[in-house]
Amino acid sequence: ARNGDHCPLGPGRCCRLHTVRASLEDLGWADWVLSPREVQVTMCIGACPSQFRAANMHAQIKTSLHRLKPDTVPAPCCVPASYNPMVLIQKTDTGVSLQTYDDLLAKDCHCI
Amino acid sequence: ARNGDHCPLGPGRCCRLHTVRASLEDLGWADWVLSPREVQVTMCIGACPSQFRAANMHAQIKTSLHRLKPDTVPAPCCVPASYNPMVLIQKTDTGVSLQTYDDLLAKDCHCI
């Protein structure tokens, strides 16, 4: 159950997709990736207030227990709900190869 | 790629399965659930230091970018990798029903 998309903390403060530009050096990939040289990394960032984009029943439970025991139970966390693939040109034992990574770029976010 | 399970912060400090006892009242379920009266909620709690239980490539990227831009990119977060089902006896319009929830109790944890 994907709950409300209205952010009570103000526009852009809650869990959503952000884009962060990163070089191969930033990612620690310079020694094994040839291309792309720079990646527009899409990731999920933001707060998860009560029932905001709750991914499932577990997220709803977590919200309830966090309200009761904030020192014990953390609030739900903003994580990818799905991913976009990304193709890298990478070095291999025999030379160079195209490789698709299915879990690299966040496509959609939820709270869990 | 599920990375290292050694916690550099000390035993029990990193992302792992915890059990939190909760009543129907705690969960806000008292008006629609009859049984169980108390739930041993298994959830994922703990820190996600560099490459600890990294769920996938995205988690590895997040770790790298958090190190570079800690104010912009949060550290990976401890969330369920899989769930155990749970059966509730719940009230319905016509009486009482058994209902299985597949996404209620965390079974295994990782960082993402």
């Epitope: 291309s35 193709v87 040109i89 034992d93 025999t94 030379g95 160079v96 190869s97 195209l98 490789q99 | -």
Partner: antibody
Amino acid sequence: EVQLLESGGGLVQPGGSLRLSCAVSGFSLSSYDMTWVRQAPGKGLEWIGIISGSGNTYYASWAKGRFTISKDSSKNTVYLQMNSLRAEDTAVYFCARGILVYADYGDHNLWGQGTLVTVSS
Amino acid sequence: DIVMTQSPATLSVSPGERATLSCQASEDIYTNLAWFQQKPGQPPRLLIYAASTLASGIPARFSGSGSGTEFTLTISSLQSEDFAVYYCLGVYTYISAEGAFGQGTKVEIK
């Protein structure tokens, strides 16, 4: 010795299908990407697509849907399945080792001699 | 879709002269570019890969430069065997991967 040999070309009617083969020797298909390229008579080269060592496929936008690249590593053969063929698909079809824009270790220029496909009624 | 545009379509050069061929990519392809030489009835021959690296067995009079969207192949002193058609190939990768050749530049004797 490392070799690539295309086969399966010939005359086919418009709307028909054809499967080209590229038999390789001297290396393992699980370790190398393979590219298909075509060239219409008197025209330029056209990139069709790639199959990676791990089996992922990538296509030119015009080839998606009609052309399918596959391989059988046990037979050391890469295939190009072509469906709904048109007159403009008439060309010499080449297979080549690697992604071409970067060199693999060893021989940098491994191409087959090509096989001619003629689409005509 | 990635589009590679070569210029000029034909280049008339005298033996011993310098030839400069251009290739432009519609997307930023970093150094994902190769140059090929082709003569009638033969498969293409790799000259330059990674935009500027000379392939094995290729004479040093061939050189490549550029990155991103603008690339150049230079033949410093044309020999008789260099008169042929030259193609650039670019590969763009992001959410998928796609390659494209330029339309070719014919280098002919002036």
